[in-house]
């Protein structure tokens, strides 16, 4: 299709080489009458409308994204060629930063319902640059935490070093929806609830003598509880002896509850104590079996191919640890009688 009629938007993504961050493009289809797609939209390309993330369709996945190759080749369907770019409804998610993401991205409705709809498309020219030696050492992170029940704020990473007075008008989105009342470089939250969690996008306009473009940053906001003050506790095994049958395979499970920690490095290991020797056993990876805001339950199993006489004279020790401390639980095997 002819993309010359598409409205154009220029975006800049300045990414930090220190941290993992994501980026999003919204399919900002012009919808002055809030109609379905761009039906009867007679705007010329020069009359750029107020862009809003497209919310007019009942089926929000009814858009198609393309990338325009720089060498003039035909448009490429994003889904087929770019595994690190994911389409979610009307939004394009870039999972990894890098200058190779620079380029022109076009979105348009999948269903063309009238001749007027042909021009219903948006071309986004994305420039991606690594952050130069930051003039601001402590720029806000692309991953921010809000403590439940307290006050907090969400800062726009690209503007976090500017005072509120200097800051340009900022447009904020949460999970793709415009937050119309927020215009500052910081969103202040009086009391944090779990619904404040989500993907926030902040946009502001930067201009030079030639052109203007939108500077965009994405912030993943997590609502958290305070760090635990407790060492982990072992939920299983509870008993320190376990009846077993000689010659049969055996799996002993260790389940431990770890309280929330912002920097979470749980340790769960099995040791064998054989008289006065003790060594760590190579066992399958630990797995999380339940995760809530407050805590996480992690399980790790030790597997014996068959229980031997010697195993009855050993102790199997589960060791768990977080930043506060550690806990152990040992299990002695006992032969089943009769």
């Amino acid at each position: 299709f002819n993309i010359s009629g598409c409205s154009t938007k220029k975006l800049l993504w300045t990414y930090s080489t220190r941290s993992e961050e994501e980026f999003v493009l919204f399919c900002d289809l012009p919808e002055p009458q809030k109609s379905h797609f761009c039906h009867r939209n007679r705007l010329s390309p020069k009359q750029v409308p107020e862009h809003l993330p497209f919310m007019g369709s009942n089926d929000l996945s009814d858009v198609q994204w393309y990338q325009q190759p720089s060498n003039g080749d035909p448009l490429e369907d994003i889904r087929k060629s770019y595994p690190h770019i994911i389409q979610d409804k009307c939004t394009l998610h870039f999972l990894t930063p890098g200058v190779n993401n620079s380029g022109s991205y076009i979105c348009r409705p999948k269903m063309i319902k009238s001749p007027y709809d042909v021009a219903c498309c948006v071309k986004m020219i994305l420039e991606v640059k690594p952050q130069t030696n930051a003039s601001c050492e402590y720029s806000a992170s692309h991953k921010q935490d809000l403590l439940l029940g307290s006050t907090g704020s969400i800062s726009c990473p690209s503007l976090s070093c500017q005072s509120d007075a200097q800051s340009p008008a900022v447009t904020w989105y949460k999970n793709g929806k415009l937050l119309s009342v927020e215009r500052s470089n910081r969103i202040v939250v009086d009391e944090v609830y779990d619904y404040h969690q989500g993907t926030y996008v902040c946009d502001y306009t930067q201009s030079d003598t030639v052109s203007s473009w939108t500077v965009r940053a994405v912030v993943q906001v997590r609502t958290i509880v305070g760090d635990t003050k407790l060492k982990p506790d072992i939920l299983d095994p509870v008993e320190d002896t376990l009846e077993v049958e000689l010659g049969k395979p055996l799996t002993i499970s260790c389940k431990a509850r770890f309280g929330f920690e912002r920097v979470f490095n749980p340790v769960i290991k099995w040791y064998i104590k054989d008289s006065d020797l003790e060594w760590e056993v190579s066992v399958p990876e630990a797995k999380s079996i339940k995760s809530t805001l407050k805590d996480e339950i992690i399980e790790r199993n030790i597997i014996l191919e068959k229980v031997t006489q010697r195993d009855l004279r050993r102790k199997f020790v589960c060791f768990v640890q977080n930043s506060i401390g550690n806990t152990t639980q040992s299990v002695q095997l006992k032969e089943k009688r009769g």
Epitope: S275, K315, K334
Partner: antibody, heavy 111, light 110 residues
Framework: SLEESGGDLVKPGASLTLTCTAS?????????MCWVRQAPGKGLEWIGC???????TWYATWAKGRFTVSKTSSTTVTLQMTSLTAADTASYFC??????WGPGTLVTVSS | AQVLTQTPSPVSAAVGGTVTINCQSS????????LAWYQQKPGQPPKLLIY???TLASGVPSRFKGSGYGTQFTLTISDLECDDAATYYC??????????FGGGTEVVVK
């Protein structure tokens, strides 16, 4: 540490009980407490063990029947020997597997 | 019953030299590595050198090196010193029963 006691000069056919006294560690932690002997000028020979936390015992094939290992308190293990012969003459060591040995006690069987 | 066969015996080497002692088990030791090496001098109890086939016991010089798996094990003593003159024993721990001692290897340092 470990210390053996009870070594003596006895006549063939006699019985004798050796005692191993432990200090500085707890039997409840679960150790193999074993007896090993060494005849003069010969190598080490394993006799039998008791697992200190649950009392399980096991023996070398040749020692079954004549030798009995028991835990008599939270710090002592004994070796009862019956029908002794001159071939049983040896230094008897108490061994906490794998690292701790007593100095040994000498048993001499002679008429 | 398990049998541990040690070879050779005796073995002699000059100060600064290297000796290698082999230990073969009639069946695999527990976990394929539950084997220890001891040094014994006359009138003394044995002293632990190596456990779990290759782990050096605390305070033992790194000149002593253990290796092996399953049924075949080796103790190597390099940069031999006069004080290394002693009898060396391998000891295996087994899944089905208890322990077995090798017959011992006397190391003579010239």
């Amino acid at each position: 540490s470990l210390e053996e006691s009870g070594g003596d000069l006895v006549k063939p056919g006699a019985s004798l009980t050796l005692t191993c006294t432990a200090s500085g560690f707890s039997f409840s932690s679960g150790y193999d407490m074993c007896w090993v002997r060494q005849a003069p000028g010969k190598g080490l020979e394993w006799i039998g063990c008791i697992y200190s936390s649950n009392g399980l015992t096991w023996y070398a094939t040749w020692a079954k029947g004549r030798f009995t290992v028991s835990k008599t308190s939270s710090t002592t293990v004994t070796l009862q020997m019956t029908s002794l012969t001159a071939a049983d003459t040896a230094s008897y060591f108490c061994w906490r597997v794998w690292s701790l040995w007593g100095p040994g006690t000498l048993v001499t069987v002679s008429s | 019953a398990q049998v541990l066969t040690q070879t050779p015996s005796p073995v002699s080497a000059a100060v600064g030299g290297t000796v290698t002692i082999n230990c073969q088990s009639s069946q695999s030791v527990a976990d394929n590595n539950l084997l220890a090496w001891y040094q014994q001098k006359p009138g003394q109890p044995p002293k632990l050198l190596i456990y779990k086939a290759s782990t050096l016991a605390s305070g033992v010089p790194s000149r002593f090196k253990g290796s092996g798996y399953g049924t075949q094990f080796t103790l190597t003593i390099s940069d031999l010193e006069c004080d290394d003159a002693a009898t060396y024993y391998c000891v295996g721990g087994y899944s089905t029963s208890g322990y077995a001692f090798g017959g011992g290897t006397e190391v003579v340092v010239k």
